[in-house]
């Protein structure tokens, strides 16, 4: 079948990194500079992606593969193939329509991207709070109160990270 196909279509013999040049009697010609073909048998080469502006080059374009971009510091990739760059926030913040905003009391974000998530509710697992949560960190749950034998010393959790009545943002 392969032999039959190549007799019928000489372009099928053109490997990746080349294209089947109709102007030169269907000879396999190398892709011109700043273009590539990632599969064999192609009649044209694709233009290489240029990583400009807020994008920076993670991998250079070659004759057989497209360039790959990532984002300049302070931004992170979004979308397939890093089609967009989104602003980083600090830990303890989330990105809103009006920019980076602190996590509301009772929520946290330990990354530079994503949304603030509620602190773990230790009591749902029958446990107690060992370490209080902050904007940047989830609470740490400790053993359940019942696990502490009558004479055992319990860990006193530290003071809350914020004053009561802290109004978010």
């Amino acid at each position: 079948f392969e032999r039959t196909r190549s007799l019928q279509d000489p372009c099928s013999n053109c490997p990746a990194g080349t294209f089947c040049d109709n102007n030169r009697n269907q000879i396999c010609s190398p892709c011109p500079p700043n273009s590539f073909s990632s599969a064999g048998g192609q009649r044209t080469c694709d233009i290489c992606r240029q990583c400009k502006g807020v994008f920076r080059t993670r991998k250079e374009c070659s004759s057989t593969s497209n360039a790959e971009c990532d984002c300049t510091p302070g931004f992170h990739c979004l979308g397939a193939g890093c089609s967009m760059c989104e602003q980083d926030c600090k830990q303890g913040q989330e990105l809103t329509k009006k920019g980076c905003k602190d996590c509301c009391f009772g929520t946290f974000n330990d990354q530079k991207r994503g949304i603030c998530r509620p602190w773990t509710n230790c009591s749902l697992d029958g446990k107690s709070v060992l370490v209080n949560g902050t904007k940047e960190r989830d609470v740490v749950c400790g053993p359940s109160p019942a696990d502490l034998s009558p004479g055992a010393s319990s860990v006193t959790p530290p003071a809350p990270a914020r004053e009561p009545g802290h109004s978010p943002q």
Epitope: K52, G53, F75, M84, C85, E86, K97, G99
Partner: nanobody, 121 residues
Framework: EVQVVESGGGLVQPGGSLRLSCAAS????????IGWFRQAPGKEREGVLC????????IYADSVKGRFTISRDNAKNTVYLQMNSLKPEDTAVYYC??????????????WGQGTQVTVSS
């Protein structure tokens, strides 16, 4: 098609001030954010400030807080970057860009050619 053109760069002494302008043509600034980025020699491009279509300001670089401000004049289709208390480390080519929103940039955004700012005694 939107075009953005920067102006106002130059040589200034440490502690001095400069005001950069970014003029947009081909489309109204009412519908676009405008951001300023900079690139120092041998360093990666970094975000400085951005102003949304509604006037909300985003500071990308902590190092410019309290020294740089951004404002817009929609009637003139121009955004200004006021730079005070300039330091040698502010030396860079400053670029203006017109994304749709300050938080997200794409390859469709329009960038200017840049204006050189040199802070030196």
């Amino acid at each position: 098609e939107v075009q953005v053109v920067e102006s106002g760069g130059g040589l200034v002494q440490p502690g001095g001030s400069l005001r950069l302008s970014c003029a947009a043509s081909g489309s109204s600034l009412d519908y676009s954010a405008i951001g300023w980025f900079r690139q120092a020699p041998g360093k990666e491009r970094e975000g400085v400030l951005c102003i949304s279509s509604s006037g909300d300001v985003t500071i990308y670089a902590d190092s410019v807080k309290g020294r740089f401000t951004i404002s817009r004049d929609n009637a003139k289709n121009t955004v200004y970057l006021q730079m005070n208390s300039l330091k040698p480390e502010d030396t860079a080519v400053y670029y203006c860009v017109a994304p749709r929103i300050c938080s997200t940039y794409s390859s469709d955004d329009y960038w200017g050619q840049g204006t050189q700012v040199t802070v030196s005694s």
